[in-house]
């Protein structure tokens, strides 16, 4: 009979064991264990009848298709075998054990005691067959095993081979190299690789296989296992395999698909190819006259670009547009994207107008092209070029007029100062009062009219000032101070100030330049109690044009001593001859109390100590500070008066041969103007030179060339 055993271990004994087994007996034990296990069988006791080749009694161990062992007897002989210490191992998970006794036993035989157990199969060690073994890594466990793959590989659905994901390779560069995965190592199994070369339309892909070419093949059937196919539009080239690479392929297309297929077996090294884009050739190019083409090549193909540039002093001209460079491109149809432009000489065009200046052309026909030369000059004698610049400008390669020092900036024509169009008389008779000034004698003289319309009725007064530049007037702070204040110093609104320049006769303002104020700047330390720091500036709304009747006066050098005692200076003004008259009467045309024609007087500088003493001897709190100086005569008769305030006291500077403003008419009194021993007090301008330049926003160096040393 047959006994089915399914346990992982067990014991098998001969019938009647440990008594002797019966005759004519046959028992089969079928042992089945799970897959991944084999069966190990060994005997603890064995005693059967001996016979030649175990013909009588025996124990036979077998699998489905193979006898593993036949045992009988008590001890092994040449013709019979006992198990002894031998272990029987099934190749698979099934083992069949058959016990048989014949009809007669000459003596009593005790039979056998056997044990079996399921033992794990180490598939990783034992699988020799490539068809079954793991492609990369094998991992054994009790009852089974599994496979895994190297980095970058994926386990195939057969759970054994390792493939790669290589179906998404896009190449868009004009040249490139494509290889089988892992090249030059063997390519992965069970893979479907797809390589797409997609170039811009107009290019054609050329393929060339290089180095090793090794794809599994078959001696009879063309490429049944692994292969390359090349798809160009509807056309398919290949399959290719074996060890001989295909010849270079000119696809005549900008789009190519390369398919590579590998099956689940084989160890081949794969392939490598390079591809290159080819384009249509464009015609040869000739550089323009006075120009060049970069890069310079014998041949140009689709997508090649060239840059056309011109020699120094020339500009690329394309469709009447000037440019520095022009780029053209070889198109897919083998034509150039544009015609070669021409090179045109750079033209700086008409040079910029110079305020208060003139332009002369050094080159014939007033040429304004590259390397042409012009010369700027200032309107002399009223303006002089700053820093004694040459004024020479050359047309540069960039198309701009360039000066060696100033670059593309225009020169500056600075007003000349202290040089009247008429020379001032060197001697003035010591007469009582002043005399009429000829037009152009005091071209810096300004009449400042202040009309404060913010009060009802309006306040109106006037004073004098001195032109320092085309935009700035120097005057006394008390002229521009809001009059309705007792001790506080607040400037009048700029809207209330009008400045007249080039004025000779106040009855005829038609020839004068009148200007509004853009800014009114009082010295921050002006003291209304003692008139210390009595200096102010008016910035004009627009620069005034200079000419014979309108020219600035020079500022002095910074010297705390001020003008030397007994030096003679001139001061001009339309001041009041009768001090008891009101400004409204002065401004109205019917009165002669305001001098119609500009008056001037020559006065000597009074030693400081003498002036201080003359004022200290008076009742009242008079203070002649170091920021003031006095001028006039002990006996009186000549003086400045109301309405002259802010006017310039000028002294001729022998070094520079120019008239310099040393003082500003400030105060005097309390007696009438021109009284005996009543000196006029003037603001000492030389103490404020830095402050004046700072307010005007000009570096002091600007003025240095004007007052040569």
């Amino acid at each position: 009979h047959t006994v089915e055993l399914n346990n992982m271990f067990g014991q098998i004994q001969s019938p009647g064991y440990p008594d002797s087994y019966p005759s004519d007996s046959e028992v089969t034990w079928n042992i089945t264990v799970p897959d991944g296990f084999r069966i190990k069988l060994y005997f603890m006791h064995f005693n059967l009848e001996s016979s030649y080749l175990c013909e009588y009694d025996y124990v036979k161990v077998e699998t489905e298709d193979q006898v593993l062992a036949t045992f009988c007897g008590r001890e092994t002989t040449d013709t019979e075998q006992t198990p002894g210490q031998e272990v029987v191992l099934s190749p698979g998970s099934f083992m069949s054990i058959t016990f048989r006794s014949d009809f007669s036993n000459e003596e009593r035989f005790t039979g056998f005691d056997a044990h079996y157990m399921a033992v794990d199969v180490d598939e990783c060690k034992e699988r020799e067959d490539e068809e079954l073994s793991c492609d990369h890594y094998c991992h054994n466990y009790i009852g089974g095993y599994y496979c895994s793959c190297r980095f970058g590989y994926i386990l195939h659905t057969d759970n054994r081979t390792c493939r790669v994901e290589c179906s998404d390779n896009l190449f868009t560069q004009r040249t490139g190299v494509i290889t089988s995965p892992d090249f030059p190592n063997p390519y992965p199994k069970s893979s479907e690789c797809l390589y797409t070369i997609e170039l811009e339309e107009g290019f054609m892909v050329n393929l060339q296989f290089e180095d090793i070419f090794d794809i599994e093949d078959h001696p009879e059937v063309p490429c049944p296992y692994d292969y390359i196919k090349i798809k160009v539009g509807p056309k398919v080239l290949g399959p290719f395999c074996g060890e001989k690479a295909p010849e270079p392929i000119s696809t005549q297309s900008h789009s190519v698909l390369i398919l590579f297929h590998s099956d689940n077996s084989g160890e081949n090294r794969g392939w490598r190819l390079s591809y290159r884009a080819a384009g249509n050739e464009c015609p040869e190019l000739q550089p323009p006259v006075h120009g060049k083409i970069e890069p310079s090549q014998a041949k140009y193909f689709f997508k090649d670009q060239v840059l056309v540039s011109c020699d120094t002093g020339y500009k690329v001209l394309k469709d009447n547009v000037e440019m520095d460079t022009f780029q053209i491109e070889c198109l897919k149809d083998g034509t150039w994207s544009n015609k070669i432009p021409t090179c045109k000489i750079v033209d700086c065009r008409a040079p910029g107008e110079l305020e208060h200046g003139l332009i002369t052309f050094s080159t014939r026909n007033n040429l304004t092209t590259y390397k042409s030369e012009i010369k700027y000059s200032c309107q002399e004698p009223y303006y002089k070029m700053l820093n004694n610049n040459t004024g020479i400008y050359t047309c540069s390669a960039q198309g701009v007029w360039m000066n060696k020092v100033l670059g593309r900036s225009l020169p500056t024509c600075l007003p000349e100062c202290g040089q009247p169009s008429r020379s001032l008389p060197s001697l003035v008779k010591r007469i009582i009062g002043g005399r009429n000034a000829e037009p152009g004698l005091f071209p810096w003289q300004a009449l400042i009219v202040v009309e404060d319309t913010s009060r009802v009725p309006n306040d109106k007064w006037f004073g004098s000032g001195a032109l320092l530049s085309a935009s700035w007037i120097l005057t006394a702070a008390h002229v521009l101070r809001s009059q309705r204040r007792d001790t506080t110093v607040i400037p009048v609104s700029k809207e209330h100030v009008t400045v007249y320049l080039g004025l000779h006769d106040v009855r005829d303002k038609s020839g004068a330049v009148n200007s509004s104020a853009a800014r009114v700047v009082l010295h921050p330390d002006f003291n209304i109690q003692n008139y210390n720091h009595d200096i102010a500036l008016v910035q004009l709304q627009e620069p005034v044009p200079l000419g014979p009747h309108v020219m600035p006066v020079c500022l002095p050098r910074l010297e705390p001593e001020g003008p030397a005692p007994h030096m003679l200076g001139l001061v001009a003004g339309w001041g009041i001859s009768n001090p008891n008259v009101t400004v409204d009467e002065i401004i109205s045309s019917g009165t002669r109390t305001l001098s119609d024609v500009l008056q001037y007087v020559k006065l000597p500088v009074v030693p400081h100590a003498e002036c201080k003493t003359s004022y200290e001897s008076r009742s009242g709190n008079y203070s002649v500070t170091e920021n003031m100086f006095c001028a006039g005569y002990y006996e009186g008769g000549k003086d400045t008066c109301l309405g002259d305030s802010g006017g310039a006291f000028v002294i001729f500077d022998d070094l520079s041969q120019r008239w310099v403003v040393q003082g500003l008419v400030s105060w005097g009194g309390p007696e009438e103007c021109g009284s005996k021993q009543v000196y006029g007090v003037y603001t000492k301008v030389s103490n404020y030179v830095d402050w004046v330049w700072e307010q005007m926003g000009l570096p002091q160096s600007v003025v240095e060339p004007q007052v040569e040393r």
Epitope: R455, W461, T582, L642
Partner: antibody, heavy 113, light 112 residues
Framework: QVQLVQSGAEVKKPGASVKVSCKAS????????IEWVRQAPGQGLEWIGE????????DYNERFKDRATFTADTSTSTAYMELSSLRSEDTAVYYC??????WGQGTLVTVSS | DIVLTQSPDSLAVSLGERATINCKSS????????????LAWFQQKPGQSPKLLIY???TRESGVPDRFSGSGSGTDFTLTISSLQAEDVAVYYC????????FGGGTKVEIK
């Protein structure tokens, strides 16, 4: 015609603030100073300060510097005077004046608890 | 601040008679630059706003009767009503126009 029209009478509690308005017409409001003057019942005139509407410049009588604020709205040609921390002695008629010829009709401000 | 002292405090004058009001300043009000005295005179009738009569010490405002005149310079100023009319009954104030502006205490003019 040229005139200054002031806001109506106000009654305020001590410690409160009052804002009196003065609307100008008939001249260029921005270019002339507006003064503020007050007159306590049966008393003389007292100058509070002034504003130039175009620039916003102001001058204050020291006595009122901490409590009075002048403003001007040029779009409506209206000047304002605000007086804070009111006390009973601030009871007065407050005038705005175009410096210095044209007077408003006055605004009575009564400060009473 | 400049202090203005008006005198007398009140004045009773017969109709057609001259009325004189004085105003003394603690500081000189003459401005040598504009050659003006910054002093004005105002008239305030009962229940009305003040009205400008004289500015710059002596200039009559337009529309003001010529019986009103101003004089003086520096620190001493006078308002004169040459022939008092019934409509001239009012309080008269002087005002100086250096900031901060100040007013005199006022002079009440009545008919005797």
């Amino acid at each position: 015609q040229v005139q200054l029209v002031q806001s109506g009478a106000e009654v305020k509690k001590p410690g409160a603030s009052v804002k009196v308005s003065c609307k100008a017409s008939g001249y260029t409001f921005t270019g002339k100073w507006i003064e503020w003057v007050r007159q306590a019942p049966g008393q003389g005139l007292e100058w509070i300060g002034e504003i130039l509407p175009g620039s916003g410049s102001t001058d204050y009588n020291e006595r009122f510097k901490d409590r009075a604020t002048f403003t001007a709205d040029t779009s409506t040609s209206t000047a304002y005077m605000e007086l804070s921390s009111l006390r009973s002695e601030d009871t007065a008629v407050y005038y705005c004046v175009r410096s210095e010829d044209l007077w408003g009709q006055g605004t009575l401000v009564t400060v009473s608890s | 601040d400049i202090v203005l002292t008006q005198s007398p405090d009140s004045l009773a004058v017969s109709l057609g008679e001259r009325a004189t009001i004085n105003c003394k300043s603690s500081q000189n009000l003459f401005n040598s630059r504009t050659r003006k005295n910054y002093l004005a005179w105002f008239q305030q009738k009962p229940g009305q706003s003040p009205k400008l009569l004289i500015y710059w010490a002596s200039t009559r405002e337009s529309g003001v009767p010529d019986r009103f005149s101003g004089s003086g310079s520096g620190t001493d100023f006078t308002l004169t009503i040459s022939s008092l009319q019934a409509e001239d009954v009012a309080v008269y104030y002087c005002k100086q126009s250096y900031i901060p502006f100040t007013f005199g205490g006022g002079t009440k003019v009545e008919i005797k």
